[in-house]
Interface confidence: low
Amino acid sequence: LPAQVAFTPYAPEPGSTCRLREYYDQTAQMCCSKCSPGQHAKVFCTKTSDTVCDSCEDSTYTQLWNWVPECLSCGSRCSSDQVETQACTREQNRICTCRPGWYCALSKQEGCRLCAPLRKCRPGFGVARPGTETSDVVCKPCAPGTFSNTTSSTDICRPHQICNVVAIPGNASMDAVCTSTSPTRSMAPGAVHLPQPVSTRSQHTQPTPEPSTAPSTSFLLPMGPSPPAEGSTGDFALPVGLIVGVTALGLLIIGVVNCVIMTQVKKKPLCLQREAKVPHLPADKARGTQGPEQQHLLITAPSSSSSSLESSASALDRRAPTRNQPQAPGVEASGAGEARASTGSSDSSPGGHGTQVNVTCIVNVCSSSDHSSQCSSQASSTMGDTDSSPSESPKDEQVPFSKEECAFRSQLETPETLLGSTEEKPLPLGVPDAGMKPS
């Protein structure tokens, strides 16, 4: 170690180093002083004189100890979708970050070069993963038993309320409506809003969509109307469902007894058992506007009653592409104008053990006045215990539905609800919704 401190400029000992905040000038072959942050080298050192520093001019800076001849230029002013989180000074560059509701689609060394608005999930879809400073929102379709009725970048799918008596069953974009009794929730709703990201991070991480929790049958078509909101199977409590089932069973027995009595009176009613045919639409038709449902009548034996464990209360299959399934006997595929029904029964995912029992009882009470048949059908609602995870998807099952159900469905699912508005996305910078794989 030298006995006394050397003052710059000085010639370093062979093999030794210049000290911190000094640099080695090749021309002078001396250790010279660096300039402090906010300054630059106006005159380089010589063998006899040290570096002469000068302050950076406006809109320029140096952040480190340096010996550069010119200060660095500050970045351009922040754009309208950005917030200036660090002003340009002589010692630091301007830093722009995205304002709330936007994310950084293209980052730079510090701050953000290009911001894009966070995707908004439309009704029937909820936030699967919230947006961050550097990644877009990921939407997923609301699973059976949950709904989202907002267009939002923060709202998740919420559970339907459970009613003692249901006025209108809930669907993916609408909560259940109860009749004048206090409803309960099927599960704790939790936080409806996800926290809005605060843009502070400057290091860019590539948005990587996490494995989707959306059903594997879901799809997102790039053009045309968005896939309508998901099916409207009600999420009812099991005891209520049992009561409905037992009642329906009772009505079925009454119908059978009634028909037996008619037979004994030896009147022969011509009772037409009405059964709607379920079309087998290709995937591209399933997306279009639904035409009027056609009733194809099948003549069955008098006094017959049919009961089915398939659900007829569920709405049109909103998302799933048609799977090629064998048609049930007597139910052949028909014209393009017909709707397609699907059950709301769910596969339990590894995480959720949920059962959903769908009961449909169609009871035909046949009276034989004037040898004409008056068949009244009683249709039950779906009942179930959907303690299930969002990854469940409705099974595509083709089932008959009665005329009453057609009327009931048309109240709920007008063309406006079926043809949901397309998801607004001003900049095509975000990743596709995880799980929303194009078919």
């Epitope: 370093p12 210049c18 080695y24 000038d25 010996w67 001849p69």
Partner: nanobody, 122 residues
């Protein structure tokens, strides 16, 4: 455009060693200096070690790392190395490679690597 690519970070026990390397590529006109800075959360980046151009290739080190860290450079590859020995828990940080380059007009330009995490923990 100049790119700085770092490697060599990781988890090491106290007293252990790591060797960081940083390769500069792209349109390099002239290098004023290359070195390493480090940053821990909620604190400013601090200089760890730096090599400046010169006949004797003088080095600069932060007091906290003197005698433990050694910076070196391969001029042919435009690569700088930081050999870190006798590592301490307080050396845990994100280490950034830094290059101060001269542009064609003589102006100096800062370039930074993406950073590599060094964690010293038992």
């Amino acid at each position: 455009q100049v790119q700085l690519v770092e490697s060599g970070g990781g988890l090491v026990q106290p007293g252990g060693s790591l060797r960081l390397s940083c390769a500069a590529s792209g349109s390099i006109f002239s290098i004023y200096a290359m070195g390493w800075y480090r940053q821990v959360p909620e604190k400013q980046r601090e200089l760890v070690a730096e090599i400046t151009e010169g006949v004797n290739t003088p080095y600069a080190y932060a007091d906290s790392v003197k005698g433990r860290f050694t910076i070196s450079r391969d001029n042919a590859k435009n690569t700088v190395y930081l050999q870190m020995d006798s590592l301490k828990p307080e050396d845990t940080a994100v280490y950034y490679c830094h290059a101060l380059l001269a542009g064609p007009g003589g102006g100096g330009y800062d370039y930074w690597g993406q950073g590599t995490q060094v964690t010293v923990s038992s």
